[in-house]
């Protein structure tokens, strides 16, 4: 049975086996096509989601689709139902929390009162002044809190208490990539992790431990990637894995927050990387223990210089490392989070690519998560 399952797939009506390598090859090998059913699927970027959250205290902004202008949500008459609608528009199913925060002196958007129409937030037509003088600060999910704060050093062994959102993504029980828990159903990782194996069936997620082999595996229901862009082959290195059963959160299993849409990190901003990847370039072996390291944002202009990536780092990517080199993500860390701490931890990047590991002029290149928020929200909404 084990050998059959490993090398063959059972087609129904009529019952017969096909080689497992024929799964997800684009050809219908089973009469009913079930060999192409449970495969990595691509999902288009989709329409603009008409709500977003700003790094200014997680304040809610709403799009006026007629003009294309964004407005800040006034706290006047804002209700729990409106908060739920806003979060549902972003694909969240959990119970949100919201509060009033004072309109700041730097408020550059017009402030409008919010109403609801066909399960979408709208601006109230006859919106007068914002009498409360407050904006809506909205949190769709409790995220980005860990039991332990890491110390700022070079590279050291990590504890799952510090990084309860880190998962190991495994194919046939072998660690392939890292990933981050975003909510009970969803894990964020890199699309290139699935290039070799596009059948969902053999992929598993392991959460809740800093040791590679020591925790139970979770079944995967769907793997979704963004449509590939043949003009920029290294862009769009992002994937979402939907778990078959929702996670139960605990001290060692928790979600990390998505970044705010306007999360622009300046060069030298401190960030963290974690993973079970190779400890040396071409080092031949994964680390059994989760490792963590502090790095910093490296300016894209510097990263695109002639002695570095020569323009290959696009607007949808970011670079991180340390100027002198030596601290970097490596093979096996792919898909894991590049993290920034403000009030909570945010996954600002996904370990994507780079030339070598730890070179001074070629730091790690990461998928910029804020560039894909719209896509993430559209995937989640489609799966609600």
């Amino acid at each position: 049975k084990v050998i059959l399952d490993k090398y063959y797939f059972l087609c129904g009506q009529p019952l017969h086996f096909i080689p497992r390598k024929q799964l997800c090859d684009g050809e219908l090998d089973c009469p009913l096509g079930e060999d192409e059913e449970h495969c990595v699927k691509s999902f288009p970027e989709g329409p603009a989601v008409a709500v977003r959250l700003s790094k200014d205290r997680s304040t809610l902004q709403v799009l006026d689709s007629a003009t294309g202008n964004w407005f800040s949500a006034c706290f006047d008459n804002f209700t729990e139902a409106l908060a739920e609608t806003a979060c549902r528009q972003m694909g969240y199913s959990s119970k949100p929390t919201f509060r009033a925060v004072e309109i700041g002196p730097d408020q550059d958007l017009d402030v409008v009162e919010i109403t609801e129409n066909s399960q979408e937030l709208r601006m109230r037509n006859s919106s007068g002044p914002c009498l409360s003088g407050s904006l809506v600060s909205l949190h769709c999910l409790a995220c980005g809190k860990s039991l332990k704060t890491p110390r700022v050093v070079g590279v050291e062994e990590a504890s799952v208490d510090s990084w309860p959102w880190q998962v190991s993504i495994q194919y046939d029980k072998q660690h392939v990539c890292g990933g981050s828990i975003l909510d009970p159903h969803w894990v964020l990782t890199a699309a290139h992790c699935f290039r070799k194996h596009t059948d969902v069936f053999n992929w598993k997620v392991r959460a809740g431990s800093d040791k590679l082999g020591s925790f139970p595996s979770l079944a995967v229901a769907k793997i979704i990637i963004i449509e590939f862009n043949p003009m920029y082959p290294k862009d769009n290195d992002i994937a979402l894995m939907k778990l078959q059963f929702p996670l139960t959160f605990s001290g060692t299993v928790r979600p990390i927050c998505l970044p705010f849409f306007d999360e622009e990190l300046t060069p030298a901003t401190p960030l963290w990387i974690i993973g079970w990847g190779f400890t040396k370039q071409n080092g031949g072996k994964m680390s059994d223990i989760l490792l963590q390291a502090s790095v910093q944002v490296i300016d894209s202009t510097r990263c695109n210089a002639d002695d570095a990536y020569q323009g290959e780092v696009t607007e949808k990517m970011m670079c991180a490392g340390i100027p002198e080199g030596g601290v970097d993500t490596c093979q096996g860390d792919s898909g894991g989070p590049l993290m920034y701490q403000s009030d909570q931890w945010h996954v600002v990047g996904i370990v994507s690519w780079g030339y070598g590991c730890g070179g001074p002029s070629t730091p790690g290149v990461y998928t910029k998560v804020s560039a894909y928020l719209n896509w993430i929200y559209n995937v989640w909404k489609a799966e609600l």
């Epitope: 603009a48 862009n229 003009m231 607007e315």
Partner: antibody, heavy 116, light 107 residues
Framework: EVQLLESGGGLVKPGGSLRLSCAAS????????MHWVRQAPGKGLEWVSA???????YYPGSVKGRFTISRDDSKNTLYLQMNSLKTEDTAVYYC??????????WGRGTLVTVSS | DIQMTQSPSSLSASVGDRVTITCRAS??????LNWYQQKPGKAPKLLIY???SLQSGVPSRFSGSGSGTDFTLTISSLQPEDFATYYC?????????FGQGTKLEIK
């Protein structure tokens, strides 16, 4: 000299097949993403297909299932196999190299005429 | 697919004129926009990539600007060799798409 040179165009009947070639020289072909772009007489440019360095292929809906792009890195040559040709496939076919999101190198083109 | 719309479709100008061609995308494409020049019977030639970066060897009288949905190609002082058809192209998402072209003719 860095260049691309297409060949294989000609007159073919609707439903027929044709294979275009594109010979590359003066650059590292094996590490380049290559595309085909076409231009119907007196009309604009239309992307036709792309092939990655690992041989992965991409097509728009208009040609998917009829056209096949391939490459032979040992010969520095790009191919486009066109089957079930329609009159609307009549165009000049260009091969082009992509770098950082733009077509930075183009061939001179080869004319394909589909007519009965 | 993202639609690219150029305006005008054609325009007449004289040597020495300043000319602007615009390109509008059906959705935001950030700065993922390129401009090409094509002369009759020839292959297109890259002028500007990433909205405003001048391709090596292209005269500095050509410049590009814009981001999001609206972009412009400007020729500061038309030269006789600039009379041609100009195309914009987005590389933001699959499939890559081109504008319908702007034919620049001698007045």
């Amino acid at each position: 000299e860095v260049q691309l040179l297409e060949s294989g165009g000609g007159l073919v009947k609707p439903g027929g097949s044709l294979r275009l070639s594109c010979a590359a020289s003066g650059f590292t072909f094996s590490s380049s993403w290559m595309h085909w772009v076409r231009q119907a007489p007196g009309k604009g440019l239309e992307w036709v297909s792309a092939i990655g360095t690992a041989g992965d292929t991409y097509y728009p809906g208009s040609v998917k299932g009829r056209f096949t792009i391939s490459r032979d890195d040992s010969k520095n040559t790009l191919y486009l196999q066109m089957n079930s040709l329609k009159t609307e496939d009549t165009a000049v076919y260009y091969c082009a190299r992509v770098r950082l999101g733009h077509f930075d190198l183009w061939g001179r083109g080869t004319l394909v005429t589909v007519s009965s | 697919d993202i639609q690219m719309t150029q305006s005008p479709s054609s325009l007449s100008a004289s040597v020495g004129d300043r000319v602007t061609i615009t390109c509008r995308a059906s959705q935001s494409i950030s700065r993922y926009l390129n401009w090409y020049q094509q002369k009759p019977g020839k292959a297109p030639k890259l002028l500007i990539y990433a909205a405003s970066s001048l391709q090596s060897g292209v005269p500095s009288r050509f410049s590009g600007s814009g981001s999001g949905t609206d972009f412009t190609l400007t020729i500061s002082s038309l030269q006789p060799e600039d009379f041609a058809t100009y195309y914009c192209q987005q590389s933001y998402s699959n499939p890559p798409t081109f504008g319908q072209g702007t034919k620049l003719e001698i007045k």
